[in-house]
C-alpha cells in the first residue's frame, strides 16, 4: 500500500503539472494579447483609469444604453437584442467614436472648437451602413425653436471661408430635460474615409431664438457624458455558407 500511495502522489503531481502548464500557457497568451493591444494603442503600459473616470467619459445617449443591453445579452435570456444578421449572414457592428483634439481645430479663432474624430481601421467607406452624429442640447426654460447647424471645417479659401455646411435642422424644444438629437453624417464620413486629408473636423451650433448655443460641445460641471459622439454601423462581408 506504500507503493500505491506513492503511485497516487505521482499521478496527482502529474495532473498538477499539467494544470500549471495550462495555466501558464493561458497567462502568457493573455499577456501577449495585452502587449498587442498596447502596441496598437501606442502605449507602453496599461492606462490607469478608474471606473469613475470611465463612467464620466462614456456617452449617456440611447445608443450606449442599447449597446450595453445588447452586449450583456449573453448573461441573460430576457432580452431580444443581438448582433443584427441579414439573410446572407452579414453582421453589423456598432462603433461609438468619441471626439479627440486636433491641432488644426485648436488654432481656429485661437480657441478650441468641437469636434475632430479619428476613425478605427474597422470603419471602411464601403462598409458604412449608417453614421449618426449625436449631440446633446441643454434644457430650455421656455418653449423655443432651435436651429441646429453642423459645419465641416475646410482649408481656408481665398475669401477666408473656413466652413461648409453639412446639415441644418429646425426643432422645437419644450422646458424640461435636455434632449439627445442625432444627425445623419454617412456621406460626410464616407468622404472622410476616402480622403482622410479632408477630415479637418466639424463645428456644431444649436442656437435658440435668443441666439444662445444649447449644444454641449465641451461639457461643463454636471455634464459628464454629454459630449457629442459618432455612432457608426459597419457591416462585414456577407458569408452565404455560414449556417
Amino acid at each position: 500500500n506504500e507503493n500505491s500511495e506513492q503511485k497516487e502522489n505521482v499521478e496527482k503531481e502529474g495532473l498538477c503539472n499539467a494544470c500549471t502548464w495550462r495555466q501558464n500557457t493561458k497567462s502568457s497568451r493573455i499577456e501577449a494579447i495585452k502587449i498587442q493591444i498596447l502596441s496598437k494603442l501606442r502605449l507602453e503600459t496599461a492606462p490607469n483609469i478608474s471606473k469613475d473616470v470611465i463612467r464620466q467619459l462614456l456617452p449617456k445617449a440611447p445608443p450606449l444604453r442599447e449597446l450595453i443591453d445588447q452586449y450583456d445579452v449573453q448573461r441573460d435570456d430576457s432580452s431580444d437584442g443581438s448582433l443584427e444578421d441579414d439573410d446572407y449572414h452579414a453582421t453589423t457592428e456598432t462603433i461609438i467614436t468619441m471626439p479627440t483634439e486636433s491641432d488644426f481645430l485648436m488654432q481656429v479663432d485661437g480657441k478650441p472648437k468641437c469636434c475632430f474624430f479619428k476613425f478605427s481601421s474597422k470603419i471602411q467607406y464601403n462598409k458604412v451602413v449608417k453614421a449618426q452624429l449625436w449631440i446633446y442640447l441643454r434644457p430650455v426654460e421656455t418653449p423655443t425653436t432651435v436651429f441646429v447647424q453642423i459645419l465641416r471645417l475646410i482649408k481656408p479659401m481665398k475669401d477666408g471661408t473656413r466652413y461648409t455646411g453639412i446639415r441644418s435642422l429646425k426643432l422645437d424644444m419644450n422646458p424640461g430635460t435636455g434632449i439627445w438629437q442625432s444627425i445623419d453624417v454617412k456621406t460626410v464620413l464616407q468622404n472622410w474615409l476616402k480622403q482622410p486629408e479632408s477630415n479637418l473636423g466639424i463645428e456644431i451650433k444649436a442656437l435658440d431664438e435668443n441666439g444662445h448655443d444649447l449644444a454641449v460641445t465641451f461639457p461643463g460641471p454636471g455634464e459628464d457624458g454629454l459630449n457629442p459622439f459618432l455612432e457608426v454601423k459597419v457591416t462585414d462581408t456577407p458569408k452565404r455558407s455560414r449556417r
Epitope: K51, R55, L58, K60, A61, P62, P63, R65, E66, I68, D69, Q70, Y71, D72, V73, Q74, R75, D76, S78, S79, D80, G81, D172, N174, G176, T177, G178, I179, W180, Q181, S182
Partner: antibody, heavy 119, light 110 residues
Framework: QVTLKESGPVLVKPTETLTLTCTVS????????ISWVRQAPGKGLEWVGI???????YYASWAKKRLTISKDTSKNQVVLTMTNMDPVDTATYYC?????????????WGQGTLVTVSS | DIVMTQSPATLSLSPGERATLSCTSS????????LSWFQQKPGQPPKLLIY???TLAYGVPSRFSGSGSGTDFTLTISSLQPEDAATYYC??????????FGQGTKVEIK
C-alpha cells in the same frame, strides 16, 4: 407640447390578446427609447419592456413569451401586444419616454390606461 | 431574478423632519449608478426625481437628494413638506436589457 398618451381596450377577456398604443407628440421616436411599465391596483410599478430608438426590443423575463413591442415612427406610435391575458395582468399600463434607471429616462409619462382582465 | 428591496415599507414623519428611504438591489446595478428614484401620488403617473443615483432631475426641489453606489442606495428628503406625501420607487438597470423597480416606500405626513 411634448406628450405621451396610451389608448386601447378597457376590458379584455382571459386568453385574449391585448393591444395598447402609445401615441407621442413632440418626440422623435427615431431618437428616443420608449418604455412600458404597468401597475396592478394598489401595487407597485413593474417594468414590462422597451423599444429602443433603433427599434430593438428588450422585455421583462416574465413577459418575454407573450409580449411584442413595435413602433411606427411615421405615425408617432408605439404598440404593445400581449397575448394570453390573465386576470393577474389587470393593471394600469404606462408608456414613458426613455428608460427608467438610465440617464434621465422616465422624465415624461403618459397618464396610463387601466386594463381589466375578466370574463 | 433581480430583487430590489425598499425599506421601510411606510414612513410616517412630521413636516420639517428628515426622511431617509433605502433601496437595496440583489445585484449591482450597471456601472454602479444606473439607478433612479420616482415619486408617485395616487391617480398620477410616476415623476422622476433622481437619476444616475444622485443627479437631481430638472425642476425637482433641492430638498431631495440621492446617494449610494452598486447595490445600496438612499433617497433623502432633508425637510419634509406636506406635498411630499407619496409613494417613492427606486428603479435599477443591469445591462442585458434587464430593469427592475423596488416595491415602493409610502411616505405619510403626520
Amino acid at each position: 407640447q411634448v406628450t405621451l398618451k396610451e389608448s386601447g381596450p378597457v376590458l379584455v377577456k382571459p386568453t385574449e390578446t391585448l393591444t395598447l398604443t402609445c401615441t407621442v407628440s413632440g418626440i422623435d421616436l427615431s431618437h428616443t427609447d420608449i418604455s412600458w411599465v404597468r401597475q396592478a391596483p394598489g401595487k407597485g410599478l413593474e417594468w414590462v419592456g422597451i423599444i429602443s430608438y433603433a427599434g430593438k426590443t428588450y422585455y421583462a423575463s416574465w413577459a418575454k413569451k407573450r409580449l411584442t413591442i413595435s413602433k411606427d415612427t411615421s405615425k408617432n406610435q408605439v404598440v404593445l401586444t400581449m397575448t394570453n391575458m390573465d386576470p393577474v395582468d389587470t393593471a394600469t399600463y404606462y408608456c414613458a419616454r426613455g428608460v427608467p434607471a438610465y440617464s434621465h429616462g422616465g422624465d415624461l409619462w403618459g397618464q396610463g390606461t387601466l386594463v381589466t382582465v375578466s370574463s | 431574478d433581480i430583487v430590489m428591496t425598499q425599506s421601510p415599507a411606510t414612513l410616517s414623519l412630521s413636516p420639517g423632519e428628515r426622511a431617509t428611504l433605502s433601496c437595496t438591489s440583489s445585484q449591482s446595478v450597471y456601472h454602479a449608478n444606473w439607478l433612479s428614484w420616482f415619486q408617485q401620488k395616487p391617480g398620477q403617473p410616476p415623476k422622476l426625481l433622481i437619476y444616475w443615483a444622485s443627479t437631481l432631475a430638472y425642476g425637482v426641489p433641492s430638498r431631495f437628494s440621492g446617494s449610494g453606489s452598486g447595490t445600496d442606495f438612499t433617497l433623502t428628503i432633508s425637510s419634509l413638506q406636506p406635498e411630499d406625501a407619496a409613494t417613492y420607487y427606486c428603479a435599477g438597470g443591469y445591462g442585458g436589457g434587464r430593469y427592475a423597480f423596488g416595491q415602493g416606500t409610502k411616505v405619510e405626513i403626520k
